[in-house]
């Protein structure tokens, strides 16, 4: 999906209002310095591409993020403010359902959500030069 035509300001507002709080809740009890940010993004569409991938695509050691509260709200925000987004997700969700495992918060998941927090912070500061 090409995130170029999303309403970035509305997605940012939804993130600041509630999605960010849900990410913090998920990470509660974890030190903010515990994980290094290894995933980066260069502009808002790129950030949303990476956020979408880390949130909804199962990875080795962390198959369960798509059922978390922040993921549900992220899906809603992308569907509402990115034209045609929900139509592109049908095949991806069917494949994910087949692979879905029991919901467990692993250290790998915490690391992945830490990366997500970094991507969202970058999304909110699109004019900053890439480090």
């Amino acid at each position: 999906y090409d995130f170029t035509n999303c309403d970035f300001e509305k997605i940012k507002a939804a993130y600041l209002s509630t999605i960010s709080k849900d990410l913090i809740t998920y990470m509660s009890g974890t030190k903010s310095t515990e994980f290094n940010n290894t995933v980066s993004c260069s502009n808002r569409p790129h950030c949303l591409t990476e956020i979408q991938s880390l949130t909804f695509n199962p990875t080795a050691g962390c198959a369960s993020l798509a059922k978390e509260m922040f993921a549900m709200k992220t899906k809603a925000a992308l569907a509402i403010w990115c034209p045609g987004y929900s139509e592109t997700q049908i095949n991806a969700t069917q494949a994910m359902k087949k692979r879905r495992k029991r919901k467990v918060t692993t250290n790998k998941c915490l690391e992945q959500v830490s990366q997500l927090q970094g991507l969202w912070r970058r999304f909110n500061r699109p004019l900053l030069k890439q480090q």
Epitope: K10, A13, A14, L16, S17, T18, K21, D22, I24, T25, A66, K67, M69, M72, K73, K75, A76, A77, A79, I80, Y85, S86, E87, Q89, I90, A92, T93, Q94, K97
Partner: antibody, heavy 122, light 108 residues
Framework: EVQLVQSGAEVKKPGESLKISCKSS????????INWVRQMPGKGLEWMGQ????????TYNGNFKGQVTISADKSISTAYLQWSSLKASDTAMYYC???????????????WGQGTTVTVSS | EIVMTQSPATLSVSPGERATLSCSVS???????LHWYQQKPGQSPRPWIF???NLASGIPARFSGSGSGTEFTLTISSLQSEDFAVYYC?????????FGGGTKVEIK
């Protein structure tokens, strides 16, 4: 204008099956989660589960998982709640509710259907 | 699961008086994830307050919400006849979504 219109009241016998509906209009149906909420006679509200019509993704309250099935048909902008074998304890009012970001970007159930009364009695 | 406890179950108030409704949450949640709904007999619930303190569209300013963490409050500064109803708090912090048992505001 956003509207959620639910199917009419139902009277059923224990063991029968049932599928009630919630037809949406006035917004992009595929892009918003639809929730189902139960209210037993004289009682409070209980969240049963939700569906994202865009891809059919569902989340259930564990208390209702296996008891009901939530589905949606995008082509007619309609969500469904169904039972394969009703019990007397399923007698209740059932509401569908859209969830979305309000003007302050808080996420909540912003529009509700009028409710469907289900009565299960022998 | 997060348990929402509302008190009192019934509040008897005279028109013009102040009403304070409480919602206690079993584990701390962000204020952005606490909402209030109003329900009148024979009607569907209506969104009333979003994110602890933000009035839904068309809700009169005599209503206000406050709180944080595990304790939240809905206040009606001067009750009008149309305010007599049941009010539910609800959390959107974790699954399953849960509602409080409701507070019925009735005429004294």
């Amino acid at each position: 204008e956003v509207q959620l219109v639910q199917s009419g009241a139902e009277v059923k016998k224990p063991g029968e099956s049932l599928k009630i509906s919630c037809k949406s209009s006035g917004y992009a149906f595929s892009s918003y989660w639809i929730n189902w909420v139960r209210q037993m006679p004289g009682k409070g509200l209980e969240w049963m589960g939700q569906i994202f019509p865009g891809d059919g993704d569902t989340t259930y309250n564990g208390n209702f998982k296996g008891q009901v099935t939530i589905s949606a048909d995008k082509s007619i902008s309609t969500a469904y709640l169904q039972w394969s074998s009703l019990k007397a304890s399923d007698t209740a009012m059932y509401y569908c509710a859209r969830s979305g970001f309000d003007y302050g970007y808080f996420y909540a159930m912003d529009y509700w259907g009028q409710g469907t009364t289900v009565t299960v009695s022998s | 699961e997060i348990v929402m406890t509302q008190s009192p179950a019934t509040l008897s108030v005279s028109p013009g008086e102040r009403a304070t409704l409480s919602c206690s949450v079993s584990s701390s949640i962000s204020s952005s994830n606490l909402h209030w709904y109003q329900q009148k007999p024979g009607q569907s619930p209506r969104p009333w307050i979003f994110g602890t303190s933000n009035l839904a569209s068309g809700i009169p300013a005599r209503f206000s919400g406050s709180g944080s963490g595990t304790e939240f409050t809905l206040t009606i500064s001067s009750l009008q006849s149309e305010d007599f109803a049941v009010y539910y708090c609800q959390q959107w912090s974790s699954y399953p979504l849960t509602f409080g048992g409701g507070t019925k505001v009735e005429i004294k």
